[in-house]
Structures are given as structure tokens and as C-alpha cells.
Interface confidence: medium
């Protein structure tokens, strides 16, 4: 999915009022310093690609993001303020039903969210060159 | 299974205020949003506005911007739809809907879900 | 706004008649179309999402088809309950827009 076209400013607010809050108490208990941020993004819609990428697709050591609060108010604001997203997310959405996952909090979930966190703080601050 | 049950007929003055409610019953309210539809008497269905529970945001059709106001009171899985300024072609059935849902297994952008409707009537 | 315009406005048909309805949208709307069937007095019931997904308990004489802004609903083999009005409806940015109305009349 191209994010180009998406309503940048609903989603940073979006992501300030709420998300932003809901990853912090999935961190509860872990060190800021813990993780070093490996993921990096150059733009809005770059960034964007990378959260969606991070927070819905399974990795190794970490499959049940997707059941987060943190996630399905990431996927709320995707449907709602990018045009079109949400049928992208038929096909893929049919599938997934098929794989359920137990939720399970790791230390490699934990390392995820952390990267996470890092990407929707670049989202918000577009104008910084990139380090 | 969700399910939602709209507040009763009205009828009111013209250049006054309607408040309709529609409660949700059945599932995560915050999970999706709430549209309302409305159908003048012999005509099609006509979008108003949308409420987005789990931001607390609403959209309005351009042609009602100003005139609507729509909210949701999470405590009470209720949303409200409130309509100023009213003339006879406001006359109408106005329908809450469930629209779209946002939870773990993304669904899509039909009402899948209605309320009953609620006839108002502006009569002066 | 996105307009979204239906033809025909109306239509008689039989039982077992095949049944065409055509719905096209101003500007590219990808797949985001939804179709509604309404009877009088009733509130609509999505039938379609996604363009060509059938809802769920829909039967599945009816089928969507159709991306950017060109879309269609076709009913195999109309039955006695499927005469109502159809409406299509676009929800590309969250903005819903209808299409005016298909009814669907016994010959």
C-alpha cells in the first residue's frame, strides 16, 4: 500500500492523543535505554510502511502484536485517514484468520515495540534530517 | 452479535434541534464506528457523518457541516446524532449504522450493521 | 465529493431473469464500493464489500465486480424476494457517498 496520500496531521493526533499512550504502558517495566533503535524511516509515508510493516506482519520471536491495543488503533487510523487501505486488508485480513496466535509478551516483542516507538516518534518530527 | 436500537419518532418545530440516540449492544463499541444515514420520504439514503469511538473523532458530509453534530459516550456504548437549524426537508428517517470494524481481524467499509430508524418530522 | 451514479434508475424483470445493475464513480475509487439491498419500510442490508466480497448469509446469486470507477452487481437468477431498491456506495476516504437507487420491479 502506498501511504502518500494519507492524512498526515489526523494521525500524528491520532497518535498523541492515544497510540502514543498505549505503547508506553505495553513497555511498562522496561528500561528506555534497554533497546538500541535499529529501524529507521526517511518520510511520512516511509515511516508509516515500517509501523505497518513492524506491527501487523509476524516475526520471528514476536507473532501476537496484532491483538495489541496499541495495533488496532494503528489499524484504525490506517483504514480511516488513508484512502483505500482498508481494502488492501481484505485478502491479508482472510488469511490471518486462519493463523490465530496465543498472546504472548517476549523480550524479542519487547525489542519490537521498542523499535516501534522510534519510528512513530520520526512519523512526528518529518522535517529533521535524517541521522 | 451487535445490535443497535435507535430513540423514538419525533416531531419538531421548525428552526429547532433533534437529538437521536443509538445504543449498541453485543460487541466492542470502540471496535468500530457508528455512521448515520438519512432517508427523506421516496428518496435514497444520504451519508451525514461518521463517529470514530476509539479516537473520539467525527466527519461530516460537507452538505450537513455545521448543522450536525455527532458524538459518543463510551460509558454507555450510545451514540448521539443532533440536527440544528431544522426545516421541512429534514423530514426524514434518519438510521445510525455500524461502519467498518477496527479490531484484531480488519473488516471493511460497508454497514454491516442498522439501527431500526428513527422517523423525524419537521411540521410547524 | 466522490458522485456515484446508478443505471438504470429502475428496472421490471422476472423470476429466473438475469439482473444487471451498473454503478460508476466520478473519480477512482480503487475497490472501495459496497452494495445495499433495501426493502420499503426496512432499513438497507449490505450485500457486497470490497467491490466483489460477498457479505456474510448473502446468497450467493449476487456478485460484485468492478475496481477504480466502473463497478457492477449482477443476481444470477432473480427470486421473489430480491425485488427492493440497490444502492451502491463509496467509502474510499470515509466519506460515503451513495448512488441514487436501482429499483428493482416485477414485470
Known amino acids: 500500500y502506498d501511504f502518500t496520500n494519507c492524512d498526515f496531521e489526523k494521525i500524528k493526533a491520532a497518535y498523541l492523543s492515544t497510540i502514543s499512550k498505549d505503547l508506553i504502558t505495553y513497555m511498562s517495566g522496561t528500561k528506555s535505554t534497554e533497546f538500541n533503535n535499529t529501524v529507521s524511516c526517511s518520510n511520512r509515508p516511509h515511516c508509516l510502511t515500517e509501523i505497518q510493516s513492524l506491527t501487523f506482519n509476524p516475526t520471528a520471536g514476536c507473532a501476537s502484536l496484532a491483538k495489541e491495543m496499541f495495533a488496532m488503533k494503528t489499524k484504525a487510523a490506517l483504514a480511516i485517514w488513508c484512502p483505500g487501505y482498508s481494502e488492501t486488508q481484505i485478502n491479508a485480513t482472510q488469511a490471518m484468520k486462519k493463523r490465530r496466535k496465543r498472546k504472548v509478551t517476549t523480550n524479542k516483542c519487547l525489542e519490537q515495540v521498542s523499535q516501534l516507538q522510534g519510528l512513530w516518534r520520526r512519523f512526528n518530527r518529518p522535517l529533521l534530517k535524517q541521522q | 452479535q451487535v445490535q443497535l436500537v435507535q430513540s423514538g419518532a419525533e416531531v419538531k418545530k421548525p428552526g429547532s434541534s433533534v437529538k437521536v440516540s443509538c445504543k449498541a449492544s453485543?460487541?466492542?463499541?470502540?471496535?468500530?464506528?457508528i455512521s448515520w444515514v438519512r432517508q427523506a420520504p421516496g428518496q435514497g439514503l444520504e451519508w451525514m457523518g461518521n463517529?470514530?469511538?476509539?479516537?473520539?473523532?467525527?466527519n461530516y458530509a460537507q452538505k450537513f457541516q455545521g448543522r450536525v453534530t455527532i458524538t459518543a459516550d463510551e460509558s454507555t456504548s450510545t451514540a448521539y446524532m443532533e440536527l440544528s437549524s431544522l426545516r421541512s426537508e429534514d423530514t426524514a428517517v434518519y438510521y445510525c449504522?455500524?461502519?467498518?470494524?477496527?479490531?484484531?481481524?480488519?473488516?471493511?467499509?460497508?454497514?454491516?450493521?442498522w439501527g431500526q430508524g428513527t422517523l423525524v418530522t419537521v411540521s410547524s | 465529493d466522490i458522485q456515484m451514479t446508478q443505471s438504470p434508475s429502475s428496472l421490471s424483470a422476472s423470476v429466473g431473469d438475469r439482473v444487471t445493475i451498473t454503478c460508476r464513480a466520478s473519480?477512482?475509487?480503487?475497490?472501495?464500493l459496497t452494495w445495499y439491498q433495501q426493502k420499503p419500510g426496512k432499513a438497507p442490508k449490505l450485500l457486497i464489500y470490497?467491490?466483489?466480497s460477498l457479505q456474510s448469509g448473502v446468497p450467493s446469486r449476487f456478485s460484485g465486480s468492478g475496481s477504480g470507477t466502473d463497478f457492477t452487481l449482477t443476481i444470477s437468477s432473480l427470486q421473489p424476494e430480491d425485488f427492493a431498491t440497490y444502492y451502491c456506495?463509496?467509502?474510499?476516504?470515509?466519506?460515503?457517498?451513495f448512488g441514487q437507487g436501482t429499483k428493482v420491479e416485477i414485470k
Open positions: 470490497g467491490a466483489f
Open positions: 456506495q463509496q467509502f474510499y476516504f470515509h466519506s460515503p457517498t
Open positions: 453485543g460487541g466492542t463499541f470502540s471496535s468500530y464506528a
Open positions: 449504522a455500524r461502519y467498518g470494524q477496527y479490531g484484531q481481524h480488519f473488516s471493511h467499509g460497508g454497514m454491516d450493521v
Open positions: 463517529i470514530y469511538p476509539i479516537f473520539g473523532y467525527a
Open positions: 473519480q477512482d475509487i480503487s475497490i472501495s
